[in-house]
Amino acid sequence: MKVLQEPTCVSDYMSISTCEWKMNGPTNCSTELRLLYQLVFLLSEAHTCIPENNGGAGCVCHLLMDDVVAADNYTLDLWAGQQLLWKGSFKPSEHVKPRAPGNLTVHTNVSDTLLLTWSNPYPPDNYLYNHLTYAVNIWSENDPADFRIYNVTYLEPSLRIAASTLKSGISYRARVRAWAQCYNTTWSEWSPSTKWHNSYREPFEQH
């Protein structure tokens, strides 16, 4: 039994780091493998992660962490029984994938303005809380070409757009994702999408 693709890990910079790897053949990850991880700290102890299958030869493990700070470094040991298959390390702050924003809501009752709001996925005491920026994706269910991205570079989790920038009388969907420049993170997953019917009063044409 050998590791074909070494584990790569990403952290949500809160409580979970996810490591993925591939074996050289079909493997029952949860019965055959264990990933041991330990914070490099005088008084820490090793924790065991039981991996799950992620495709035939792929495995994934969700490492539980109390919290994360920039200096944290973890040692990782991948075991198959008594055999050490791979040894490595992981610094969560250097491999951050933020949590996806939640509770995306479209408020259509503001005069001819669409107000999109969502929730910051981090609690206020987490470092990323004040460092997230967002991308909002809006698309038409009827017209695949009607697809747009709005970059929200301010901290407030909201976006206002004129309803007239979208077509009237058709249904739209929106979703939002996050990233943090300070840690050069990857983008989060997209939030679940939300749907609304776009309608607004056309202004009277003056002749």
Epitope: L42, E45, V69, A71
Partner: antibody, heavy 116, light 111 residues
């Protein structure tokens, strides 16, 4: 709410022994390393000893090595410090502290006086 | 003598910004993170800053920490009378397999 309550302090003669206890509540005791820190009257803080969550690894300050023994009973949520061959310079308030990178919660302390 | 050196005293007037330093000796390893504790008169110490610059929940953002090499600093802005206390820095020393604490700094709020 995290609470740490020390007990077992008192007056002891030089060369004598005492056993301090620290009853923990409000958190999962078995998941946290613990430590003892002391403070002599009018002096600064001095780290004494620390123990990992399972008790597998133990550390002592040079000043107490060979005389003090730290231990824990995770089933009772209690930390202990057995102090033998006590000296006058061990006179201090002894604090029990939870460890999460630093000493993030402290008890109110128990006074140990070593005097003849 | 502590391997972490702090000034024995510091002072400031209400509203001022005060900084307390904590210096490791030249041979002190710079890999560890610094922590800061506040001890109000007659009470147990309380964690103020951990891992160089992180504040536990409940600690006002008037308190901030920073690290440079083997030294660290605690800054208190908008000084208040209730900040009058002893402040200690500390760090895990992996060469000693133990925890080292500075001698403490007594902060006095004047006037």
């Amino acid at each position: 709410e995290v609470q740490l309550l020390e007990s077992g302090g008192g007056l002891v003669q030089p060369g004598g022994s005492l056993r301090l206890s620290c009853a923990a509540s409000g958190f999962t005791f078995s998941r946290h390393a613990m430590a003892w820190v002391r403070q002599a009257p009018g002096k600064g803080l001095e780290w004494v000893s620390a123990i990992t969550s399972s008790g597998r690894s133990i550390y002592y300050a040079d000043s107490v090595k060979g005389r003090f023994t730290i231990s824990r009973d995770n089933s009772k949520n209690t930390l202990y410090l057995q102090m033998n061959s006590l000296r006058a310079e061990d006179t201090a308030v002894y604090y029990c502290a939870r460890v999460h990178r630093a000493f993030d919660y402290w008890g109110q302390g128990t006074l140990v006086t070593v005097s003849s | 003598q502590s391997v972490l050196t702090q000034p024995p005293s510091a002072s400031g007037t209400p509203g001022q910004r005060v900084t307390i330093s904590c210096s490791g000796s030249p041979l002190f390893p710079d890999s560890g993170s610094f922590n800061w504790y506040q001890q109000l008169p007659g009470t147990a110490p309380k964690l103020l800053i951990y891992a160089d610059s992180h504040r536990p929940s409940g600690v006002p953002d008037r308190f901030s920490g920073s690290k440079s090499g083997t030294s660290a600093s605690l800054a208190i802005s908008g000084l208040r009378s209730e900040d009058e206390a002893d402040y200690y820095c500390g760090t895990w020393d992996y060469s000693l397999s133990g925890y080292v604490l500075g001698g403490g700094t007594k902060l006095t709020v004047l006037g």
